[in-house]
Interface confidence: low
Amino acid sequence: GWVWNQFFVPEEMNTTSHHIGQLRSDLDNGNNSFQYKLLGAGAGSTFIIDERTGDIYAIQKLDREERSLYILRAQVIDIATGRAVEPESEFVIKVSDINDNEPKFLDEPYEAIVPEMSPEGTLVIQVTASDADDPSSGNNARLLYSLLQGQPYFSVEPTTGVIRISSKMDRELQDEYWVIIQAKDMIGQPGALSGTTSVLIKLSDVNDNKPIFKESLYRLTVSESAPTGTSIGTIMAYDNDIGENAEMDYSIEEDDSQTFDIITNHETQEGIVILKKKVDFEHQNHYGIRAKVKNHHVPEQLMKYHTEASTTFIKIQVEDVDEP
């Protein structure tokens, strides 16, 4: 009968040939009377057999990731008679893995958007690397993820590649971050290969800033001949948020005379001071009112950023008009 052990050949061998093992008949007494032959895919090009001894050699560098096993057939012939000594037999050569593939991130480019001020532990995105090496061969394809850039704002779960927030971020200070993640095989042991990917993390705005008046005092004038409804000037607050989070409403906080009103121009986000009642220079030639400004949309959970509305003082001088 045939005698052999299991055949393995390491991939990426740099030698010109590599001895894999021996195929022989137990009838072979070593006097070179038998001839061994190799048949099948790879016979003669990738593998050869010593026709006298049955020793098998790989004569080509192999790549397990391209092909992990070869199924071949062996024959042994009595040279004297030309007849088969054993029935033709099929056998397998397995290509064993070495750690020759670095982890690769297949879903690049990564981009994520998270609301600013998100709490610690908030999931941002999951990055996943793939390693072409054999997962059943030691740790060649066992990956660990780590953060090369992005501390202290982000963290990555070592075994899953899930990126989470580790420190609150303020969009008004920085609105995007580049996080660099490394995936290392061999669970980080010596001989490990690595791959990196970049993740662009953008912060979306939340309403964490209240509007604040640009000036603490505004000076306006109004003619005593001005009719009610006249716009006598504008006031303006600024808000570091953007979009609807920066939309604001102006209002009167204090006007004992009840002479003025403020309306909001939602296009320009300015407050327009309006004359509500006619004024008379001879009766009163100046007024002092206080205005306040608040955001239009404030979710309940963000009210803590909007506890005291910003206020400003407006001094209004009445201009005298000659009366007949």
Epitope: D107, E108, A112, V114, P115, S118, L123, I125, Q126, I201
Partner: antibody, heavy 121, light 107 residues
Amino acid sequence: QVQLLESGGGLVQPGGSLRLSCAASGFTFSSYAMNWVRQAPGKGLEWVSTISGGGANTYYADSVKGRFTISRDNSKSTLYLQMNSLRAEDTAVYHCAKGGMGGYYYGMDVWGQGTTVTVSS
Amino acid sequence: EIVMTQSPVTLSLSLGERATLSCRASQSISSNLAWFQQKPGQAPRLLIYGAFTRATGIPARFSGSGSGTEFTLTISSLEPEDFAVYYCQQYNYWPLTFGGGTKVEIK
């Protein structure tokens, strides 16, 4: 605008197979995760499976693991669900749903109208 | 598996009333919660994600709040088109899970 159109549903016997398709348009298909979610008659929503944008990651509900396979052809902007060994309890309307961005990458921001799968002898 | 529990199962309210829907997660899911609206014979529609961020085109009367395990969807003043079934869904952990739904019906 974003559109998702499911097809491939129908009546099948227990143990049979079906392949659902979801044709997507109006967005860069390969940039988004995609999901299958089902709804049995008169019941709530049940997540079935998710695949990442490049197809590297696939996730399945325990109830379908080993029987269903999610896949995608980014060149055709099409999502698939191969359903084998179908059971009566797989009877439902199957919706495909597009993933979102960022913290909502594995979310579901646009849904298709669904295709009906009936498993009955 | 994260279990999502919605309450109440049914909410009977009149037009213009405020609706408050609750959703509880069996363990913390941070702010990774979405709310969907579904009307009979239609596909679900995303209302809220990230616990309180309104999806594109969703009216301001819909607002979400909460984090960790307790979440709320509020409809400030019910319009005729708001009577539907509402589902919460967590996307913090695999498997993704939905709540059983809350039906908002006209009283």
